[in-house]
């Protein structure tokens, strides 16, 4: 790869390391859960709670009043925070794509089934526009099999 390309990647990496993308993840998960609920899924099925503390306590947004709010009261709050974070990537389309890829990777092991994964991916692609930002033209959101390491 070109040297200047790597330099740009480093600056992007610096932003990615500093970004708190959890509100984006929470906003999207709540959105697809609500969509599923409206099709008759039991809204209180514990296995569907992607932020149940027993599953992953350290991924909770510390500013969130509750681990998960299916009714969406906190969702607009999550969306606002999410948009504030994504706004940092507005002028760098490649870096915006990497931020979206990171969100996809972080959530990939919580998405149940191909349908939910596709739905999450669709919502994720629309996220920049929802925030009034430019969406990256080409952005591969496929997650490599094997997922990611968690520590």
């Amino acid at each position: 790869r070109q040297q200047w390309e790597l330099q740009g990647d480093r600056r992007c990496q610096s932003q990615l390391e500093r970004a708190n993308l959890r509100p984006c993840e929470q906003h999207l998960m709540q959105k697809i859960q609500r969509d599923e609920d409206s099709y008759g899924r039991d809204p209180y099925s514990p296995s569907q709670d992607p932020y149940s503390p027993s599953q992953d306590p350290d991924r909770r947004d510390p500013y969130s009043p509750s681990p998960y709010d299916r009714r969406g009261a906190g969702s607009s709050q999550h969306q606002e925070r999410c948009c504030n974070e994504l706004n940092e990537f507005e002028n760098n389309q490649r870096c915006m794509c990497e931020a979206l890829q990171q969100i996809m990777e972080n959530q990939s092991d919580r998405l149940q089934g191909r349908q939910q994964e596709q739905q999450f991916k669709r919502e994720l692609r629309n996220l920049p526009q929802q925030c009034g930002l430019r969406a990256p033209q080409r952005c591969d959101l496929e997650v490599e099999s094997g997922g990611r390491d968690r520590y």
Partner: antibody, heavy 98, light 109 residues
Framework: VKVSCKAS????????INWVRQATGQGLEWVGW????????GYAQKFQGRVTMTRDTSMSTAYMELNNLTSEDTAVYYC????????WGQGTRVTVSS | TQSPDSLAVSLGERATINCKSS????????????LGWYQQNPGQPPKLLIY???NRESGVPDRFSGSGSGTDFTLTIDSLQAEDVAIYYC?????????FGQGTKLEIK
């Protein structure tokens, strides 16, 4: 010499690893960086050709190997997490004697 | 290049350390200056104080502040405390190599 740096308490792939060295009574000298997710690396010109940075993601461990050592390489070698080096290891002392 | 090499300031007074980069560390696409300030005490690893030239790292007292853009930067310590005696380094991470300044030794007058 191969110096290791074991990460804990965070997602290893998410943050770059920097390597910095410091000779006794001297300033900080940046050696290079590695992205654990992609394996991409970048080295200071001074170390090109004799330094190699690798990682074992399954062990959350980064490695820095420095070859053809001279007494001038005697220093404490630090690994640091993140592009802007937010968290530092305690350092590994490397002594090269003739 | 950092200046001065060493500095003696009275307790409660202000300390100012300068850092000049040979090339601009400002990135227009992110609107950020990729420069950090570190504090190092004897026998300890460095500690990040300021990132992106002016953002205080979490847990760092608010008497520490960073300013500047492009090639000229300043670390200011308001109301110097005894525990601030240390060596301070700037580092640019805009482009490889991520060079450090030579360090400024801060002492109590």
């Amino acid at each position: 010499v191969k110096v290791s740096c074991k990460a804990s308490g965070y997602t290893f792939n998410r943050y770059d690893i920097n390597w910095v060295r410091q000779a006794t009574g001297q300033g900080l000298e940046w050696v290079g960086w590695m992205n654990p997710k992609t394996g991409n690396t970048g080295y200071a010109q001074k170390f090109q050709g004799r330094v190699t940075m690798t990682r074992d993601t399954s062990m959350s461990t980064a490695y820095m190997e420095l070859n053809n050592l001279t007494s001038e390489d005697t220093a404490v070698y630090y690994c640091a997490r993140g592009v802007d080096a937010t968290h530092w290891g305690q350092g590994t002392r490397v002594t090269v004697s003739s | 290049t950092q200046s001065p090499d060493s500095l003696a300031v009275s307790l409660g007074e202000r300390a100012t350390i300068n850092c000049k980069s040979s090339q601009s560390v400002f990135d227009s696409s992110s609107n950020k200056n990729y420069l950090g300030w570190y504090q190092q005490n004897p026998g300890q690893p460095p500690k990040l104080l300021i990132y992106w030239a002016s953002n205080r790292e979490s847990g760092v007292p608010d008497r520490f502040s960073g300013s500047g853009s492009g090639t000229d930067f300043t670390l200011t310590i308001d109301s110097l405390q005894a525990e601030d005696v240390a060596i301070y380094y700037c580092q640019q991470y805009h482009s490889t190599p991520h060079t450090f300044g030579q360090g400024t030794k801060l002492e109590i007058k």
